[in-house]
């Protein structure tokens, strides 16, 4: 991905502001949460390496109703190249277990402080 | 310590509804899936679906129109209502805890706690 | 649906023996295997979670492995109490599903 849009300023977005944009919101969700996020709300759980930000958002999608979430799902959808709904998920895509929204948003931002620490931005 | 108990009515008729129970101990339901899994006399086992601790369901696609699982987090139960039942699913039917571990990049699930099951026989 | 083959359907060996029995998975990468062994008119007990990892409480003597789609239980050194039905499930893909079993008699 060479630019992304949709994101808080106009127009193309590099990808290393697009994803210091999506941690800064993850580290807001995860410093602002006081009750369980989401309702104590689970999604599958995703492998972190492998077509991360698709995967993510095949699983985020699924919760509804959840304000505190919105931004980081359309975030996402900026990072994926194609369409995604709430229902699908690849029968490619393992689903193994459950976990917490709270839990989701936690491992995501870990790992997308260390892309971004690596350099990798795409 | 974990305890799972199944309790059912033993004997439906066909085209029946079947309801069973799972109560368990040592554990709240909030913090972890249920599954049910059932085995006919002699046969093999078949996992029909599981209660994640928020109350969300995933069913195996081959019985989903028939199946429903719900729970009382208070009372500690998990419900199995299977509809129109014919011969063939007489089985005996376990309830197996879902715990959940970490493993190769991402959290994965073990059934590492069942009951011991109850017999369901489906004959007029 | 991941089919999940089971083989030997039944084996048979003398007490100190090592035995395996295999499971393969029909499609699916990443799979977390679960090994059980199930005596009659009992529950299933978990041996093994993750493929590889033994449950607390197993005796050592069990192990799993893995390569590719192709997962292994061993039994090191046979004991009377190890008779029983094993199966093996797929917790990766849903449907979940069992293999058919290997039924385990002493000699």
């Known amino acids: 991905l060479t630019c992304l849009g949709g994101f808080a300023s106009p127009g193309p977005v590099p990808p290393s502001t697009a994803l210091r944009e999506l941690i800064e919101e993850l580290v807001n969700i995860t410093q602002n949460q006081k009750a369980p996020l989401c309702n104590g709300s689970m999604v599958w759980s995703i492998n972190l390496t492998a077509g991360m930000y698709c995967a993510a958002l095949e699983s985020l999608i699924n919760v509804s109703g959840c304000s505190a979430i919105e931004k980081t799902q359309r975030m996402l959808s900026g990072f994926c190249p194609h369409k995604v709904s709430a229902g699908q998920f690849s029968s490619l895509h393992v689903r193994d277990t459950k976990i917490e929204v709270a839990q989701f948003v936690k491992d995501l931002l870990l790992h997308l402080k260390k892309l971004f620490r690596e350099g990798q931005f795409n | 310590q974990v305890q799972l108990k199944e309790s059912g009515p033993g004997l439906v008729a066909p085209s029946q509804s079947l309801s069973i129970t799972c109560t368990v101990s040592?554990?709240?339901?909030?913090?972890?899936?249920v599954n049910w899994v059932r085995q006919p006399p002699g046969k093999g086992l078949e996992w029909l679906g599981i209660?994640?601790?928020?109350?969300?369901?995933d069913y195996n696609s081959a019985l989903k129109s028939r199946l429903i699982i719900n729970k009382d987090n208070s009372k500690s139960q998990v419900f199995l209502k299977m509809n129109s039942l014919q011969t063939d699913d007489t089985a005996r039917y376990f309830c197996?805890?879902?715990?959940?571990?970490?493993?190769?990049?991402?959290?994965?699930?073990?059934?590492?706690?069942w009951g011991q099951g109850t017999s369901v026989t489906v004959s007029s | 649906d991941v089919q999940m083959i089971q083989s030997p359907s039944s084996l048979s060996a003398s007490l100190g023996d090592i035995v395996t029995m295999t499971c393969q998975a029909s499609?699916?990468?990443?799979?977390?295997l679960n090994w059980f062994q199930q005596k009659p008119g009992k529950a299933p007990k978990l041996l093994i979670f993750?493929?590889?990892n033994l449950e607390d409480g197993v005796p050592s003597r069990f192990s799993g492995s893995r390569y590719g789609t192709n997962f292994t239980l061993t039994i090191s050194s046979l004991e009377d109490e190890d008779m029983a039905t094993y199966f093996c499930?797929?917790?990766?893909?849903?449907?979940?599903?069992f293999g058919g079993g290997t039924k385990l008699e002493i000699k």
């Open positions: 209660i994640w601790g928020d109350g969300s369901t």
């Open positions: 499930l797929q917790h990766s893909y849903l449907p979940w599903t």
């Open positions: 040592g554990f709240s339901l909030t913090g972890y899936g």
């Open positions: 197996a805890r879902d715990k959940t571990f970490y493993y190769d990049g991402f959290y994965r699930g073990r059934m590492d706690y």
């Open positions: 993750g493929a590889s």
């Open positions: 499609q699916g990468t990443s799979i977390n």
